[in-house]
Amino acid sequence: MKVLQEPTCVSDYMSISTCEWKMNGPTNCSTELRLLYQLVFLLSEAHTCIPENNGGAGCVCHLLMDDVVSADNYTLDLWAGQQLLWKGSFKPSEHVKPRAPGNLTVHTNVSDTLLLTWSNPYPPDNYLYNHLTYAVNIWSENDPADFRIYNVTYLEPSLRIAASTLKSGISYRARVRAWAQCYNTTWSEWSPSTKWHNSYREPFEQH
């Protein structure tokens, strides 16, 4: 049993880091493998993560952490029984993938303006709370070419667009994701999408 692709890990900068790797063949990750992780400080405990399958030869493990301090560093040991398959380290603050925003809502009752709101995935006391910016993806269910991205570079988790920038009388979906420039994070996963029927009053044409 060998590791084909070494573990790569990302942190949500709160309490969970996720590590993924690939084995050289089909593996029952939860019964055959264990990922041990330990904060590199005196008195820290070694913790054991039981991986889950992520495709035939892929494994994923969710590492629980009490907090993320900027200088934290963890040792990682991947074991198959008594055999050490891989040894590495991981600094959560250098590999951040924010949590996905939630509660995406489209408000259609604001005089031909669409107001999209969502929730910041972090509590106010988390460092990322005031550092997230967002991308909103809106697409038509009827027309695959009608696909657009709005970059929200301000902190408020909302976006206003004129309903008339979209086609009237058809259904649209929207989703949102986040990133934080300060930590050069990757993008979060997309939020669950929400659907609405776009309709607005066409302005009267004057001849």
Epitope: M14, L39, A71, P123
Partner: antibody, heavy 120, light 107 residues
Framework: QVTLKESGPTLVKPTQTLTLTCTFS??????????VGWIRQPPGKALEWLAL???????RYSTSLKSRLTISKDTSKNQVVLTITNVDPVDTATYYC????????????WGQGTSVTVSS | DIQMTQSPSSLSASVGDRVTITCRAS??????LNWYQQKPGKAPKLLIY???SLQSGVPSRFSGSGSGTDFTLTISSLQPEDFATYYC?????????FGGGTKLEIK
Amino acid sequence: QVTLKESGPTLVKPTQTLTLTCTFSGFSLSTSGMGVGWIRQPPGKALEWLALIWWADDKRYSTSLKSRLTISKDTSKNQVVLTITNVDPVDTATYYCARITRGNSAMDFWGQGTSVTVSS
Amino acid sequence: DIQMTQSPSSLSASVGDRVTITCRASENVYSYLNWYQQKPGKAPKLLIYNAKSLQSGVPSRFSGSGSGTDFTLTISSLQPEDFATYYCQHHYGIPWTFGGGTKLEIK
């Protein structure tokens, strides 16, 4: 050996700002893994965690008091300062500082505490 | 915020008794839990960290167990110096919070 000592005013008027200083020896906040936290205890009541600062200058605050608290460190003087703005009689308490080690996030050494009364 | 609930709030026992104090978290805190002892007019003292690890210099009659939401501090044979108030405290995420305390008194 590790020692910590809190200092600050014993009496503060409502709406004023309370400044508390923790002076410590036996460890350094320039050492990786070290932190100092503040905890308070109103008379006859339970302990309440307020704030902490780590060697890397990461700061953490109580949710309910965050808007009123500021924690800072002076590594060269071996001091940590906590300020509480707009104090109220409910802030009357014994205030403790404690050393924290990142390895187990436990408060393993405590100061003797300093008693603060908020009253006009 | 995670709430920590200790029971009982007070307890009477005799020297030599085996005593158990429980602490319940309002949500999973895994093993990120510490126990402290406080005597009147004194600062708290760390007894147990990470739910079950005994702090250096603390007598072996003290032990901790549990994980998730339910934790226990046990004193196997009470000594006169153990009569005090005991607090649990979690450190899973911010803010850290303490339990309301358990006052252990002489019967």
